[in-house]
């Protein structure tokens, strides 16, 4: 039974330009974490495997690093890097956990105080 | 002036599928995501889903995944909502709303969907 | 999904009352940034619904300085100064900080 769950960073509103922390967190469950994939949108960004370690997808190898431990840092963001984010925990045994994160990558004409951004 | 304008009530037999269109007049239509909410028995609002005018992205809420698909038309400013395999458990009111930092500025009037045989 | 709760599920009310909506979530709406993506919503008979509140105490712009959102974490509260007949309706809460959204159940502002 699985019976983990997985907290994320929430939602987050940024800047066009800045850069935001991506983070998910698998608690409640005592299954060893063999991947974690992050994806967006059917686009796979990035994996960290426990044996082999971190490895980005070439398309976004400039303006992603991996980390803090198991999070994701983009950078230079994009109004087109909007979008739901996707953390996919493999576990053994539990299965897979999922989370979800929207980001929202405003123009600076459209955004305002309280969308969060900090430069690179 | 920001203006959401969806369109009419319909009437469908169950089974069928139907398109809700909102067509969004007075800002940037890629600026903003838009999203669209169900209203059942005049009361419980739910999160249908939103998508990104800009990229095409969507987002959805698991209940409704398979049921429907959120699509964009940037040339005509125009977002449309597609419900699939119709039951009585859809009829209810349908509303756009454009989002902004997670929260809903403006809103459609409303697309009344009554499903019934 | 994160629930929703409001309180009371009516108000009844008269004019020039002072009220207060209640809504608390069950985690809390406070993003790693220390964002809160909390709102409300005025659902009027007829109409579609209005934003009221943003970022937990932000007024919408056009919004009367009669209400007022206050709160933090998972305790967030509405509350209007002098009740009007404008603003009889259903009120909502909503979540915007975990997927999916959720609102609350609604609170309905109604005349004694």
């Known amino acids: 039974m699985m019976t983990g769950t997985i907290e994320t960073t929430g939602n987050i509103s940024a800047e066009k330009g800045g850069s935001i922390i991506l983070q998910c967190h698998l608690s409640s469950t005592t299954a060893q974490v063999t991947q974690v994939n992050w994806e967006q949108q059917d686009q796979l960004l990035a994996i960290c495997n426990a044996d082999l370690g971190w490895h980005i997808s070439p398309s976004f190898k400039d303006r992603v690093a991996p980390g803090p431990g198991l999070g994701l840092t983009l950078q230079s963001l994009t109004v087109n890097d909007t979008g739901e984010y996707f953390c996919i925990y493999h576990t053994y045994p539990d299965g897979t956990y999922t989370g979800r994160i929207f980001l929202e990558v405003l123009e600076s004409s459209v955004a305002e105080h309280g969308a969060r951004f900090q430069i690179p | 002036e920001v203006q959401l304008q969806q369109s009419g009530p319909e009437l469908v037999k169950p089974g069928t599928s139907m398109k809700i269109s909102c067509k969004a007049s007075g800002y940037s239509f890629t600026g903003y995501t838009m999203n669209w909410v169900k209203q059942s028995h005049g009361k419980n609002l739910e999160w249908i889903g939103l998508?990104?005018?800009?990229?095409?992205?969507?987002s959805y809420n698991q209940k409704f995944k398979g049921k429907a698909t959120l699509t964009v038309d940037k040339s005509s400013s125009t977002a449309y909502m597609e419900l699939l395999s119709l039951t009585s458990e859809d009829s209810a009111v349908y509303y756009c709303?454009?989002?902004?930092?997670?929260?809903?500025?403006?809103w459609g009037q409303g697309t009344t969907l009554t499903v019934s045989s | 999904d994160v629930v929703m709760t409001q309180s009371p599920l009516s108000l009844p009310v008269s004019f020039g009352d002072q009220v207060s909506i209640s809504c608390r979530s069950s985690?809390?709406?406070?993003?790693?940034?220390?964002?809160?993506?909390l709102s409300w919503y005025l659902h009027k008979p007829g109409q579609s619904p209005q934003l009221l509140i943003y970022?937990?105490?932000n007024r919408f712009s056009g919004v009367p300085d009669r209400f007022s959102g206050s709160g933090s974490g998972t305790d967030f509260t509405l509350k209007i100064s002098t009740i009007k007949p404008e603003d009889l309706g259903m009120y909502y809460c909503l979540q915007g900080t975990h997927q999916p959204p959720t609102f609350g159940g609604g609170t309905k502002l109604e005349i004694k």
């Open positions: 985690q809390s709406l406070a993003n790693s940034y220390g964002d809160t993506f």
């Open positions: 998508i990104v005018p800009y990229n095409g992205g969507t």
């Open positions: 970022g937990i105490s």
């Open positions: 709303a454009r989002g902004l930092s997670f929260r809903y500025d403006y």
